[in-house]
């Protein structure tokens, strides 16, 4: 039950995270005009990964796409790439994890296959989340660098009689959405990996194997299991170690070759 819950929760958290990464990537407010030094502006500028926008006080908003590929800063291209890779990996991860969900039955898919798929999707979510966090962080670093550069320009270029409005940009809403979404995808991925451990039938953890001696029957349980007399008398005992909190009867729906002799 706990495995199913962990897997399901991991899937939902990752789904929310990937939706957030997609939203952040599409948002126009990656950087917004810093109004600290110019609170009286009647024109507000903000920029995204794909276009820059201007919102006038009158309510009129105009957005212009970056119609050049080669003319864009390498950092912006890198951020775009990271976000797209994050979305693609996340989307594939979601697709894989849907089939890996314990609550969904697809043909006669074994637990080992579901475990592998859960692990795969978990790793994909982790990488997707890291890509998003990295992309947003690179952009944030770019903003901070440009902010202080333009601040320096602002104070060195004030010698003349005519002042010019130096537009500085600060963190936009998309950055925070991206960080949170990336974090959620990462957490979801970790949860999927944890769930995978509970799903996997561990080859080293054998169930009771009977050895019929000449006088009486003795059940031998290797590797951390205590020996007990009587055939099959302890089949509902909990294992001493196991990836997930499961009783032995819970895994008997898919018997393995090691079950009984």
């Amino acid at each position: 039950m706990a495995v199913t819950a962990c897997q399901g929760l991991g899937f939902v958290v990752s789904l929310i995270g990937i939706a957030g990464i997609i939203a952040a990537t599409c948002m126009d407010q990656w950087s917004t005009q810093d109004l600290y030094n110019n609170p009286v502006t009647a024109v507000f500028n903000y920029q995204g990964l794909w276009r820059s926008c201007v919102r006038e006080s009158s309510g009129f908003t105009e957005c212009r796409g970056y119609f050049t590929l080669l003319g864009l800063p390498a950092m912006l291209q890198a951020v775009r790439a990271l976000m797209i890779v994050g979305i693609v990996l996340g989307a594939i991860g979601l697709l894989v994890s849907i089939f890996a969900l314990k609550c969904i039955r697809i043909g006669s898919m074994e637990d080992s296959a579901k475990a592998n798929m859960t692990l795969t999707s978990g790793i994909m979510f982790i990488v997707s989340g890291l890509c998003a966090i990295a992309g947003v962080s690179v952009f944030a670093n770019m903003l901070v660098t440009n902010f202080w550069m333009s601040t320096a320009n602002m104070y060195t270029g004030m010698g003349g009689m005519v002042q010019t409005v130096q537009t500085r940009y600060t963190f936009g809403a998309a950055l925070f959405v991206g960080w949170v979404a990336g974090g959620l995808t990462l957490i979801g991925g970790v949860m999927m990996c944890i769930a995978c451990r509970g799903l996997a039938p561990e080859e080293t953890n054998y169930k009771a194997v009977s050895y019929h001696a000449s006088g009486h029957s003795v059940a031998y349980k290797p590797g951390g299991f205590k020996a007990s007399t009587g055939f099959g008398s302890n089949t509902k005992n909990k294992k001493i170690y196991d990836g997930g909190a499961r009783t032995e009867d819970e895994v008997q729906s898919y018997p393995s070759k090691h079950d009984y002799v």
């Epitope: 005009q33 110019n38 009286v40 502006t41 009647a42 024109v43 500028n45 903000y46 920029q47 820059s52 926008c53 201007v54 006038e56 006080s57 009158s58 309510g59 009129f60 105009e62 212009r64 005519v162 002042q163 010019t164 409005v165 537009t167």
Partner: antibody, heavy 118, light 113 residues
């Protein structure tokens, strides 16, 4: 056709208040911000403030912040500008105008002459 | 506040001749975000409210004759009437549209010589 029709001329005593109305028609009232501008006799134009009819958000010129109050009545598509503690230098023609693209004022009311005299 | 200064204060031009009005702002009205200058020109005839002629320094308002044109960038702007007509006799104002408070020039009176 967009129209902004203002109330008639007013004569007030110093220290009194005046409330000028501006009825809008020919467009969706809540879709465009409204501006109030005044023009003293033989003088230039002076921005008083801005009001957003949809949510009544206002932005005032610091010069008028304490004395001017901009309001709207969405049910009648009417904007109001009230100026208190009137002085003789407040004698002017008061205009309401629509705020549009480029932060420009595209349609204007005919103006309301407010005379402050003792 | 941005101070708008117009020159000349008045201008006498013959019918059909070119009239040029200058406007200088104390601060740049160029917005880096869209590379547009937030400067607006109005025409005011006696006893009438102002009429919008040009916004974004160069964009002509619909219905405005094409003899009216705007130019300039940053802090220096020009309104040109390529061929003055009798109905163009008015006072012309430039306005800062980039920052609050919105400020206007003192006006330039255009007359026929």
């Amino acid at each position: 056709e967009v129209q902004l029709v203002q109330s008639g001329a007013e004569v007030k005593k110093p220290g009194a208040s005046v409330k000028v109305s501006c009825k809008a028609s020919g467009y969706t009232f809540t879709s465009s911000w409204l501006i109030w501008v005044r023009q003293a006799p033989g003088q230039g134009l002076e921005w008083i403030g801005t009001i957003v009819p949809s949510d009544s958000y206002t932005n005032y010129n610091q010069k008028f912040k304490d004395r001017a109050t901009l309001t709207v009545d969405k049910s009648t598509s009417t904007a109001y500008m009230e100026l208190s503690s009137l002085r003789s230098e407040d004698t002017a023609v008061y205009y309401c105008t629509r705020f549009r693209t480029g932060n420009s004022f595209d349609y204007w009311g005919q103006g309301t002459l407010v005379t402050v005299s003792s | 506040d941005i101070v708008m200064t117009q020159s000349p204060d008045s201008l006498s031009v013959g019918l059909g001749e070119r009239a040029t009005i200058n406007c200088k702002s104390s601060q740049s009205v160029l917005n880096s975000g869209n590379q547009k200058n937030y400067l607006t020109w109005y025409q005011q005839k006696p006893g009438q409210p102002p009429k919008l002629l040009i916004y974004w320094a160069v964009a002509r308002q619909s219905g405005v004759p094409d003899r009216f044109s705007g130019s300039g960038s940053g802090t220096d702007f020009t309104l040109t009437i390529s061929s003055l007509q009798a109905e163009d006799v008015a006072v012309y104002y430039c306005q800062n549209s980039i920052a609050y408070p919105f400020t206007f020039g003192q006006g330039t009176k255009v007359e026929i010589k």
